[in-house]
Amino acid sequence: AILGRSETQECLFFNANWEKDRTNQTGVEPCYGDKDKRRHCFATWKNISGSIEIVKQGCWLDDINCYDRTDCVEKKDSPEVYFCCCEGNMCNEKFSYFPEMEVTQPTSNPVTPKPPYYN
């Protein structure tokens, strides 16, 4: 393991596909992948009238957009389906939406609001 990197070996698993088929597929997913590739966890969800509906959670494989992210945070502004990924065991247990605002006029005292967390 490279110093400072969180190795991902397992992730929280949920799959709405399986839920609707009444097979109760939730649990902990072991992440497998090529030796030279990095492994991540992810969460994807929808916000339907303020209600969070999880679509899937589990392992995600070697995506540069997930490198060195310890928290699962969606930064896109108002996506149709929210997605975040992270590194570290079970790091997708909690996920959040924290859009990166386009800053047109910098303020003298920028404030970073705390992202809303879901779990």
């Epitope: 698993f13 799959n15 596909n17 609707k20 088929d21 097979t23 109760n24 597929q25 649990g27 997913e29 072991p30 992440c31 497998y32 992948g33 994807t44 679509v55 899937k56 959670q57 589990g58 392992c59 995600w60 494989l61 995506d63 149709e80 389906v81 997605f83």
Partner: antibody, heavy 120, light 107 residues
Framework: QVQLVQSGAEVKKPGSSVKVSCKAS????????ISWVRQAPGQGLEWMGG????????NYAQKFQGRVTITADESTSTAYMELSSLRSEDTAVYYC?????????????WGQGTMVTVSS | EIVMTQSPSSLSASVGDTVTITCRAS??????LAWYQQKPGKAPRLLIY???MLRSGVPSRFSGSGSGTHFTLTISSLQPEDFATYFC?????????FGPGTKLEIK
């Protein structure tokens, strides 16, 4: 690296059943996501269903519900697909496939395929 | 059921060309889209997963893009071994469905 080896070709009569096996070599069989996909001669690909052996329960495409049974035996690292009430349109190559992840990111390792011919 | 369509259904190209194949989903599938290559008498081979991630061992001339309902597979600098049939597949919602395929032939 997982390898999937399937049972040999079958010729079946209409109305009968066929059971195709898929033996996995390598580690972690119980916690793999195994799917079954078929391809009729000269046609496209059709997902039939899948199973994670440690869970034991399978997920089926509605089209095959009631006619297909997917099972797995962890002790022998073997997955099975049984299709009943066979008809001529079930003539196809049947593949067992390992998925990259439990959430079905991509079908990355394929068996060699089993040709099932349904003919009277 | 999510219906996948591909265009074109076939195309002719020459070695060294760049080609693009399009796949559309009847409903949004987020990033749950994969691309496969199949040669006659062989099992399909995974090329791209997660819409744009290259499977280990697949040459970098293959690339995928898109999200939601519209996806593309691009093959740059075609090689003789690239002439085959290409399928897209969504695995966002069961039943997982494949596109009808695009046959890439030598001009």
């Amino acid at each position: 690296q997982v390898q999937l080896v399937q049972s040999g070709a079958e010729v079946k009569k209409p109305g009968s059943s066929v059971k195709v096996s898929c033996k996995a070599s390598g580690r972690h069989f119980g916690s793999l996501q195994i799917s079954w996909v078929r391809q009729a001669p000269g046609q496209g690909l059709e997902w039939m269903g899948g199973i994670i052996p440690i869970y034991g329960t399978a997920n089926y495409a509605q089209k095959f519900q009631g006619r297909v049974t997917i099972t797995a035996d962890e002790s022998t690292s073997t997955a099975y697909m049984e299709l009943s009430s066979l008809r001529s349109e079930d003539t196809a190559v049947y593949y067992c496939v390992k998925d990259l992840t439990w959430t079905n990111l991509g079908l990355d390792i394929w068996g060699q395929g089993t040709m099932v011919t349904v003919s009277s | 059921e999510i219906v996948m369509t591909q265009s074109p259904s076939s195309l002719s190209a020459s070695v060294g060309d760049t080609v693009t194949i399009t796949c559309r989903a009847s409903q949004g599938v987020s990033r749950w889209l994969a691309w496969y290559q199949q040669k006659p008498g062989k099992a399909p081979r995974l090329l791209i997963y997660g819409a744009n991630m290259l499977r280990s061992g697949v040459p970098s001339r293959f690339s995928g893009s898109g999200s939601g309902t519209h996806f593309t597979l691009t093959i740059s600098s075609l090689q003789p071994e690239d002439f085959a049939t290409y399928f897209c597949q969504q695995s966002y919602s069961t039943p997982f469905t494949f596109g009808p395929g695009t046959k890439l032939e030598i001009k």
